[in-house]
Interface confidence: medium
């Protein structure tokens, strides 16, 4: 999966938008969660609402909120008020019984608030290294990943 | 009408590679899985995997992994499943069935299956 | 994997009594969303297995109503209200739940 970057500005609310094919993932429900590592496991944070006819429906755990609109196919999530603590790589998953399927993988930046005069710098992400899966666009407020970016700080 | 045409009858060696056709009509390929399931002889059913047409997405059973392939051409809505490494215990009817879809909730159930393709391993 | 276990295997019934049979899964069928995807196929001699009944209960197009699905979690059950000479062959429940999707063993139908 290419993995799409998503910037937010700190403070204020992003919204992370997966489409996918509605008549493939039919019945599912989804959910969102973060990357614990390049290598970990991937900790739900939020999943749409148990029945699936009431996907639609947001649901919030903390700041975070969701809702499916299953006959277009998009997977909607708003991280609310931003902190620099949720930049990191999440994915949109697609549940079947015991299993997952990876719908989007999505890295988020966190941008310092332009108004906020501390001197923090102006973005924060999650780390360098030497290379990572290509990233592609889709929002206006994204962008693709730089060459020699990875979304997590190298393993010593 | 829904229609799932399979491969003929195929004989091979043990060590071998098979690859089987099922080719789909009378409904929209690219937009319900396909899954591969066998039957040895006077034994039961045993689900091999399955494949989403639309993007070429597989899963397969565990016991299959790293033998089996399953492929699909779109433009002629013919699905494959391909088994290496052939055995004696690979002897088996071969067959190629839909997954239902069916609203509120996909069913995941098989509503048509293929006529099947006999299989023989032996040297 | 979750296993499927049926009883009996096999079954020889009067024309026009009743039958069942019985599928029991090693965990709970119930899906992620809600639903329980268990199923009931019939394969007759020498042909593909058919649908029966999808998601416990729901009778599949063209089959007759004296077939019908019940049960919930682990334990269900198929019943045919009066058995007719078309009915014989291998009565299977699948589990499409959880990938691997599994079948029980089989249960074959005679007439006596």
């Known amino acids: 999966h290419n993995t799409t970057v998503f910037q937010g500005v700190a403070g204020q609310s992003l919204q992370v938008s997966c489409p996918y094919d509605s008549m493939k993932h039919w019945g599912r429900r989804k959910a969102w969660c973060r990357q614990l590592g390049e290598k970990g496991p991937c900790q739900r944070v939020v999943s749409t609402h148990n029945l699936w006819l009431l996907s639609f429906l947001r649901r919030w755990n903390g700041s975070t909120a969701i809702t499916d609109d299953t006959l277009g196919g998009t997977l909607t999530i708003t991280l609310r008020n931003l902190q620099p603590h949720d930049a990191g790589l999440y994915q949109c998953q697609s549940l079947h019984g015991s299993e997952a399927d990876t719908l989007r993988k999505v890295l988020v930046e966190v941008l310092a608030d332009p108004l906020d005069h501390r001197d923090a710098g102006d973005l924060w992400f999650p780390g360098e290294s030497e290379s990572f899966e290509d990233a592609h666009v889709e929002h206006s407020i994204s962008r693709s990943l730089l060459e020699g970016e990875i979304p997590f700080p190298p393993t010593s | 009408q829904v229609q799932l045409v399979q491969s003929g009858a195929e004989v091979k060696k043990p060590g071998a590679s098979v690859k089987v056709s099922c080719k789909a009509s009378g409904y929209a390929f690219s937009s319900s899985w396909m899954n591969w399931v066998r039957q040895a002889p006077g034994q039961g059913l045993e689900w091999m995997g399955r494949i989403y047409p639309g993007d070429g997405d597989t899963n397969y059973a565990q016991k299959f992994q790293g033998r089996v392939t399953m492929t699909r051409d779109t433009s002629t809505s013919t699905v494959y499943m391909e088994l290496s490494s052939l055995r004696s215990e690979d002897t088996a009817v071969y067959y190629c069935?839909?997954?239902?879809?069916?609203?509120?909730?996909?069913?995941?159930?098989?509503?048509?299956w293929g006529q099947g393709t006999l299989v023989t391993v032996s040297s | 994997d979750i296993v499927m276990t049926q009883t009996p295997l096999s079954l020889s019934v009067t024309p026009g009594q009743p039958a069942s049979i019985s599928c029991r899964s090693s965990q709970s069928l119930v899906h992620s969303n809600g639903y329980t995807y268990l199923h009931w196929y019939l394969q007759k001699p020498g042909q593909s297995p058919q649908l029966l009944i999808y998601?416990?209960?729901n009778r599949f197009s063209g089959v007759p109503d004296r077939f019908s699905g019940s049960g919930s979690g682990t334990d269900f059950t198929l019943k045919i209200s009066r058995v007719e000479a078309e009915d014989v062959g291998v009565y299977y429940c699948s589990q499409s739940t959880r990938v691997p999707y599994t079948f029980g063993q089989g249960t074959k139908l005679e007439i006596k």
């Open positions: 069935a839909r997954l239902l879809r069916n609203q509120p909730g996909e069913s995941y159930a098989m509503d048509y």
């Open positions: 998601k416990v209960s």
